[in-house]
Amino acid sequence: LRLLDHRALVCSQPGLNCTVKNSTCLDDSWIHPRNLTPSSPKDLQIQLHFAHTQQGDLFPVAHIEWTLQTDASILYLEGAELSVLQLNTNERLCVRFEFLSKLRHHHRRWRFTFSHFVVDPDQEYEVTVHHLPKPIPDGDPNHQSKNFLVPDCEHARMKVTTPCMSSGSLWDPNITVETLEAHQLRVSFTLWNESTHYQILLTSFPHMENHSCFEHMHHIPAPRPEEFHQRSNVTLTLRNLKGCCRHQVQIQPFFSSCLNDCLRHSATVSCPEMPDTPEPIPDYMPLW
């Protein structure tokens, strides 16, 4: 988790002088509780936005937006702590809005936004906005949280972001898999425009089961430049195991931008349909 660029981040708006600061996620008001604390944020919204760095790279960011409740507690609102927790790693990053002037009621509801948390493809986050100071130990909570799922690199807008392009998102192998006679599969896919090797992983499963019954890896050496964008055809021999009929083919490239951690593409071959067993015809006709 990180913030997009390190240029000055602003949270000021008409009627409010505000500065964005790095935070340890442990606000001072936890340790030194205050008697009067503001109410919680209202209408917390998290959306996927895209932002360019100063170098011109494009990254997905969490666009966080919330409003204030229209009660007198805004008189005690000193700022907000924004926290983003990546759920699969438990990594957390926080920033603090520090209000340098007192808030006053005005004709519009106060609204705040922040769009500088860089998020990763295919990851889930918990976004929390805590109003500051935080409540006393038994006080009503004054935060709001929402989970936010970032789409993977198949998503049209994500595909062209820097992290997705680095992991090979622009390569469309257009995999086709054909079942041949004698327990064989023919796998065909389009090579990318880079002299790098690929591996094909064939994993076979019984019908309706998720425990594999066979797995085979096939290595494809780096193509020559004249083979770029051409179709590569590979014939894989299956294990002759009864019922081991559902096959998943994954192709992993080793592009220079992502090395051993490039996006894989896959295709699946289902088990052949079993013909419906016809009703047995009785050899005599009942007479009732």
């Epitope: 994993t203 594999s212 019954c213 066979f214 797995e215 085979h216 051993n260």
Partner: nanobody, 113 residues
């Protein structure tokens, strides 16, 4: 998560032999294809050998006839027996679980007189 524990690297003279092993801590080892890769200084990681769940091996052309990959499902371990070693075999050797894209830490093999 699958942990991979390797052993067996070292310094050997040209023409000599070494055996690498890679033990995987997983209850489904026997249903996983496994592979060895290597990476020489300043070069891209390259494929060495793979073995499927039926025990059938497959080799890079550069090691065919000299290297042998094998597996022992009772010990959750794959092996790479390297004979007739050449200076160009000098590299860090990595054990790989293709299904999960897990990589061992790597073990240095140096072939030099």
């Amino acid at each position: 998560e699958v942990q991979l524990v390797k052993s067996g690297g070292g310094l050997v003279q040209p023409g000599g032999s070494l055996r690498l092993s890679c033990a995987a801590s997983t209850s489904i080892f026997s249903s996983l294809a496994m592979a060895w890769y290597r990476q020489a200084p300043g070069k891209q990681r390259e494929f060495v050998a793979t073995i499927n769940t039926g025990g059938q091996p497959n080799y890079a052309d550069s090691v065919k006839g000299r290297f042998t990959i094998s597996r022992d499902n009772t010990k959750n371990t794959i092996y790479l027996q390297m004979n007739s070693l050449k200076p160009e075999d000098t590299a860090v050797y990595y054990c790989n679980v293709p299904r999960y894209n897990y990589w061992g830490q790597g073990t240095q093999v140096t072939v030099s007189s």
